[in-house]
């Protein structure tokens, strides 16, 4: 059902103009229409889902609210080009607190960027720079303080399995002064929007709702979640059946908690606990030394019905990530356990997210990891 | 992970009744709509019906209607299919089968009717 | 109802090789600007249907660049570039544009 390509081009098309002046309203309806038109064309395959009926409903009070004709001219879709830096696409009135950078220098130098990430089977770098390869089945909080809140879902990659792999993500944008209402980004597999659930692409009706928006990278593949009012910013992609997620966050929103009982535990910051972490180098040790299809003694889980052979997965792994560092070595480890060649793509991007997010260029590879207790 | 699991399938004597059941999960169901599809012992696929997502509309192949049923319960993540006056022509597995168009299907269950 | 004809209703083929099934629409399958709701579905021996490709010709999340789908009207192919053995079972179209949907015959592929 494509009903989320429709809405991401009307956003698209008429970002910037929640309420239109009257001489844009010509251009608002023709996007409108051109709307309505692109739910029609889904009606077969979207006609039985919530998502499709949200549209056709809410078209038709926007069509009411601002006097369009049903019959008139269309929009053609804006091209989907990437923003030019800077901040073009920000209001020119949106406040100085609604910039991070900006009202961060009023009273301190640059401030120190942190990384965190999550892919895979899945495997964890902490906003410390430790990595981890950890089980948490279920619904984990991955960042939790007071500006926003962002929970997975892992489900089991195999049957009986201990390897688990991201399936559903929540991100919860907290209210904050004149720049954002609260807003909520959810994906799951095969559901990658490329709006909040409100199917908005920014943070609302204030001054500064433009410090916070959504860009499809590649439709159903890759959003970008730019927050420069704490200036952060958020990948997630989808890879195979699978997602990631990755984040650039500054050291001052990172220990932005007030409760560290209950929000400090979160994954980004302590890391899994003890008994969620799989020693997934001891795995690939045994597996390097015995050159065996399964591995039991080492594997956290029954191994896959259809993996590699040690060294193809090996292989697989060395086309796309040269360096052996712990990126490869978990890319290693995902083919082992679970089969599934998409896992060698969600290594490889992972670390080209470290490339673009991390604030250090001499971290971005990562070669040892210690089994440590988390915090 | 997307999963539905079907249940409620077995033997039944022509001209009884049969309820099955398929209970969702690794997506959010109540906004989907929800398809029931058969397969014929050693035959091809036959699409029976499809359920909107808050069960406002329903949708049947000619060779059930009247005679089957699809209701959903969102709140328990479940779909369901009542089967009335069995045929011996309706022995077959049927799967449920998640969105307007189906995607991922359960694994199936079998109903058997006979004399 | 739409009747969906698919052809060959066997094909063996060697492992690396192309192989190529047709399905046939007693309608044109085009519901409105250009939108075809042909899907294809495998289903491996032993296992619930997967779908492969939707809307003629693209292919579902996580399914492999070697299925190529394409066609319109009422004529539509599934082509596999190269045969893996994983890729055994039988493949069924099926349309999505007129009501009731309704799916192809199959086709079996066996690897020789």
């Known amino acids: 059902c494509k009903i989320l390509k429709c809405n991401s081009e009307f956003w698209s098309a008429t970002s910037g103009s929640h309420a239109p002046a009257s001489d844009d309203t010509p251009e608002f309806c023709a996007a409108l229409r051109s709307y309505a038109l692109c739910t029609r064309r889904t009606a077969r395959t979207c006609r039985g889902d919530l998502a499709y009926h949200s549209a056709v409903h809410g078209i038709e009070d926007l069509m009411s609210q601002h006097n369009c004709s049903k019959d008139g001219p269309t929009s053609q879709p804006r091209l989907r080009t990437l923003p030019p830096a800077g901040d073009s696409q920000e209001r020119s009135d949106s406040p100085e607190i609604c910039h991070y950078e900006k009202s961060f220098h009023k009273h301190s130098a640059t401030p120190n960027y942190t990384h965190c990430g999550l892919f895979g089977d899945p495997h964890l770098r902490t906003f410390t720079d430790r990595f981890q390869t950890c089980k948490v089945q279920g619904a984990w909080p991955l960042i939790d303080n007071n500006y926003l809140n962002v929970q997975v879902t892992n489900t089991p990659v195999l049957p009986g399995s201990a390897a688990t792999a991201t399936s559903k993500l929540t991100i919860i944008f907290k209210n904050f002064q004149e720049c954002v209402d609260q807003k909520v980004y959810q994906a799951e597999m095969d559901e990658l929007p490329a709006a909040f659930v409100d199917g908005s692409k920014n943070g609302g009706d204030k001054h500064g709702a433009n410090s916070l928006k959504i860009t499809e990278k590649v439709s159903g593949q890759h959003v970008e979640i730019q927050a420069k009012y704490i200036g952060t910013t958020i990948v997630v992609r989808q890879v195979g059946r699978y997602l990631t997620f990755a984040v650039r966050m500054p050291e001052e929103v990172v220990n932005a908690v007030e409760d560290w009982d209950s929000q400090g535990l979160y994954l980004c910051l302590r890391g899994c606990p003890l008994n969620q972490q799989i020693d997934f180098q001891a795995f690939h040790t045994n597996a390097e030394g015995t050159g065996a299809r399964r591995l039991a003694a080492a594997s956290p889980a029954p191994t896959a019905p259809e993996t590699f052979p040690y060294e193809t997965a090996v292989a697989k792994c060395k086309e796309k990530l040269p360096v052996e560092d712990l990126y490869y070595q978990a890319c290693v480890f995902d083919l082992l356990t679970t089969g599934d060649v998409n896992f060698t793509l969600a290594a490889y991007y992972a670390l080209e997210d470290v490339k673009m997010l991390h604030s250090n260029k001499d971290k971005l590879h990562l070669y040892e990891r210690t089994r440590d207790l988390p915090g | 992970e997307v999963q539905l699991v079907e249940s409620g399938g077995g033997l039944v004597q022509p001209g009884s009744s049969l309820k099955l059941s398929c209970v969702a999960s690794g997506f959010t169901f109540s906004n989907y709509g929800m398809n029931w599809i058969r397969q014929a012992p050693k035959k091809g696929l036959e699409w029976i019906g499809m359920i909107y997502y808050d069960s406002s509309e329903k949708h049947y192949a000619d060779s059930v209607k009247g005679r089957f049923t699809i209701s959903r319960d969102n709140s328990k993540n479940t779909l369901y299919l009542e089967m009335n006056s069995l045929r011996s022509e309706d022995t077959a597995i049927y799967y449920c089968?998640?969105?307007?168009?189906?995607?991922?299907w359960g694994q199936g269950v079998m109903v058997t009717v006979s004399s | 109802d739409v009747v969906l004809t698919q052809t060959p209703v066997s094909l063996s083929v060697t492992l690396g090789d192309q192989a190529s099934m047709s399905c046939r629409s007693s309608q044109s399958l085009e519901y409105s600007d250009g939108y075809t709701f042909l899907e294809w579905f495998l289903q491996k021996p032993g296992q619930s249907p997967q779908l492969l490709i939707y809307e003629v010709s693209n292919r579902f999340s996580g399914v492999p660049d070697r299925f190529i789908g394409s066609g319109s009207g009422t004529d539509f192919t599934l082509k596999i570039s190269r045969v893996e053995p994983e890729d055994l079972g039988v493949y069924y179209c099926?349309?999505?544009?007129?009501?009731?949907?309704?799916f192809g015959s199959g086709t079996k592929l066996e690897i020789k």
């Open positions: 089968a998640k969105g307007t168009t189906p995607d991922y």
């Open positions: 099926f349309q999505a544009t007129h009501d009731p949907l309704t």
